[in-house]
């Protein structure tokens, strides 16, 4: 098994300062790690670029309640 | 970092009405999609309900719906499950949950957690 203590970090050092279509974004994921300078989610668009977004905005909680709500299922 | 702190617990009869509540502190509160799972005793943990961001939308398991209510209120950094017509079975442990990764009732999705609060419905 690797030693996840050693595995590296995606941190995100700048956000992009324009809005994107939700219709462009595939998936995100959040970066929560202490190590990081800033807390951030990176968005991967459906042509599979990666962009740093500021979670504290607007938009960016929008498109993750948007993209959220596609993974939802009738199951429960 | 979020920390998150329930309470509202106790004991109640059936068909009786108990209000859990969820405080966050750390980051961004408004950032997370919040959920209420519960865990009985023997059983696995049992998703509850979600809310997103924004607080438009909510979905509810089967076994709640029509019978309890989640919301929040980004100012007050505070998540609520508003909870009517409780019978035994729903006697658990509740906790609340913050949603940082992509996806809706899975527990794997949800970063943080509270330390549960106690429901006991009794007959």
């Known amino acids: 098994q690797p030693d996840a203590i050693n595995a590296p970090v995606t941190c995100c050092y700048n956000f992009t300062n324009r809005k994107i279509s939700v219709q462009r974004l595939a998936s995100y994921r959040r970066i929560t790690s202490s190590k990081c300078p800033k807390e951030a989610v990176i968005f991967k668009t459906i042509v599979a670029k990666e962009i740093c977004a500021d979670p504290k905005q607007k938009w960016v909680q929008d498109s993750m309640d948007h993209l959220d709500k596609q993974t939802q299922t009738p199951k429960t | 970092e979020v920390q998150l702190v329930e309470s509202g617990g106790g004991l109640v009869q059936a068909g009786g009405s108990l209000r859990l509540s969820c405080a966050a502190s750390g980051r961004t509160f408004s950032s997370y999609r919040m959920g209420w799972f519960r865990q009985a005793p023997e059983k696995e943990r049992e998703f509850v309900a979600v809310?997103?961001?924004?607080?438009?939308?909510?979905f509810y398991s089967n076994s709640v719906k029509g019978r309890f209510t989640i919301s929040r209120d980004n100012a007050k950094n505070t998540v609520y499950l508003q909870m009517n017509s409780l019978k035994p079975e729903d006697t658990a442990v509740y906790y609340c949950a913050a949603g940082a990764q992509m996806g809706w009732a899975e527990a794997s999705t949800y970063d943080y957690w509270g330390q549960g609060t106690q429901v006991t419905v009794s007959s």
């Open positions: 809310i997103t961001r924004s607080g438009g939308s909510t």
